[in-house]
């Protein structure tokens, strides 16, 4: 039961996280015009990974795409790449994890295969989350650097009568969405990996039984592996992929209220 819950929750958390990563990648508010300590403008600027926008007091919003690849900063390209890699890995991870879910029966798929798929999807979610967090962090670092550079420029070269106020940009909503989403995907991935340990067939148990049968003085009790395998004391040592056999996790296979988030 605990394994099913952990796996299901990991899937749902990862799903929310990946949806968040996609949302963050598409959002226009990666950086927004800094309003603090600046003259109040009737025009508000904000920028995303794909286009920059201007919202006027009139309510009119104009967005312009970055219709160039070579002219864009390398850092922006790197952030785009990280976010896309994160989305792709996350999407593949979701696809794999759907088939790996214990509550879904697909033919006569063995639990060992499900365990491998759960681990694979878990790793994919972890890498996906890390990609998103890295991408957002790189962009945030770029913003901080540019912010202080433009702040320095604001207070230099003002000897004349005419002042040019440089637009400074600060963290936009997409950064926070990206950090949270990346974190959720990472957590979901970790949960899937934990669930995998509980799904894996306990090969050590077979070895323990054969050892015992050979008459050695030292007998290995399968129950001793409880902590490391995630199994309960399954002294009967049934093959968990047998049709009629059930582990303690499978005793109640009907959905309970805890199976849904």
């Amino acid at each position: 039961m605990a394994v099913t819950a952990c796996q299901g929750l990991g899937f749902v958390v990862s799903l929310i996280g990946i949806a968040g990563i996609i949302a963050a990648t598409c959002m226009d508010q990666w950086s927004t015009q800094d309003l603090y300590n600046n003259p109040v403008t009737a025009v508000f600027n904000y920028q995303g990974l794909w286009r920059s926008c201007v919202r006027e007091s009139s309510g009119f919003t104009e967005c312009r795409g970055y219709f160039t690849l070579l002219g864009l900063p390398a850092m922006l390209q790197a952030v785009r790449a990280l976010m896309i890699v994160g989305i792709v890995l996350g999407a593949i991870g979701l696809l794999v994890s759907i088939f790996a879910l214990k509550c879904i029966r697909i033919g006569s798929m063995e639990d060992s295969a499900k365990a491998n798929m759960t681990l694979t999807s878990g790793i994919m979610f972890i890498v996906s989350g890390l990609c998103a967090i890295a991408g957002v962090s790189v962009f945030a670092n770029m913003l901080v650097t540019n912010f202080w550079m433009s702040t320095a420029n604001m207070y230099t070269g003002m000897g004349g009568m005419v002042q040019t106020v440089q637009t400074r940009y600060t963290f936009g909503a997409a950064l926070f969405v990206g950090w949270v989403a990346g974190g959720l995907t990472l957590i979901g991935g970790v949960m899937m990996c934990i669930a995998c340990r509980g799904l894996a067939p306990e090969e050590t148990n077979y070895k323990a039984v054969s050892y015992h049968a050979s008459g050695h003085s030292v007998a290995y009790k399968p129950g001793g592996f409880k902590a490391s395998t995630g199994f309960g004391s399954n002294t009967k040592n049934k093959k968990i992929y047998d049709g009629g056999a059930r582990t303690e996790d499978e005793v109640q296979s009907y959905p309970s209220k805890h199976d849904y988030v």
Partner: antibody, heavy 118, light 113 residues
């Protein structure tokens, strides 16, 4: 056709209050801001501030904070300018204007002359 | 506040001649986000409300004759009437449409010589 129709001229005594109306037609009232502009006799244009009919949010120029209040009645697509504690120097023509994209004032009311005299 | 300085205060031009009005702002009105200059020009005839001529420094409002044109960027702007007509006699105002308060210039009175 977009139209802004303002209320008629007002003659008031110092210390009194006046409420100027600006009725909009020909467009969705809540979609565009209403600005107020003052023009004293023989003088230039002074931007007083604006009100967002969608949110009700107001922005005032520093010299028009306090005695000047912008308000709305969206049910009748009308914006109002209320001036309290009138002074002789408030004598002017008050215009309302629609804020359109490009932050431009594309349509203006005909103006309301407010005369403050004892 | 942004100070908008118009020059000259008044201008007398012969019919059919070119009239040029200058406007200078104390800070740049160029928005880096869309590379537009938030400067607007209005025409006001006696006893009438102002009429919009040019926005974004150089974009002519629909219905405005093409003899009116706007130019400039940053802090220096110009309104040009290529061939002055009798109906162009009015006061012309530039306005900062970028910073609050949305200040107007002092106005330039255009007359026929």
């Amino acid at each position: 056709e977009v139209q802004l129709v303002q209320s008629g001229s007002e003659l008031k005594k110092p210390g009194a209050s006046v409420k100027v109306s600006c009725k909009a037609s020909g467009y969705t009232f809540t979609n565009y801001g209403i600005n107020w502009v003052r023009q004293a006799p023989g003088q230039g244009l002074e931007w007083m501030g604006w009100i967002n009919p969608y949110t009700g949010e107001t922005t005032y120029a520093e010299e028009f904070k306090g005695r000047f209040v912008f308000s709305l009645d969206t049910s009748v697509s009308t914006a109002y300018l209320q001036i309290s504690s009138l002074k002789a120097e408030d004598t002017a023509v008050y215009f309302c204007a629609r804020l359109y994209y490009g932050n431009r004032f594309d349509s203006w009311g005909q103006g309301t002359l407010v005369t403050v005299s004892s | 506040d942004i100070v908008m300085t118009q020059s000259p205060d008044s201008l007398a031009v012969s019919l059919g001649e070119r009239a040029t009005i200058n406007c200078k702002s104390s800070q740049s009105l160029l928005n880096s986000g869309n590379q537009r200059n938030y400067l607007t020009w209005y025409q006001q005839k006696p006893g009438q409300p102002p009429k919009l001529l040019i926005y974004w420094a150089s974009t002519r409002e629909s219905g405005v004759p093409d003899r009116f044109s706007g130019s400039g960027s940053g802090t220096d702007f110009t309104l040009t009437i290529s061939s002055l007509q009798a109906e162009d006699v009015a006061v012309y105002y530039c306005q900062n449409a970028y910073y609050y308060p949305l200040t107007f210039g002092g106005g330039t009175k255009v007359e026929i010589k």
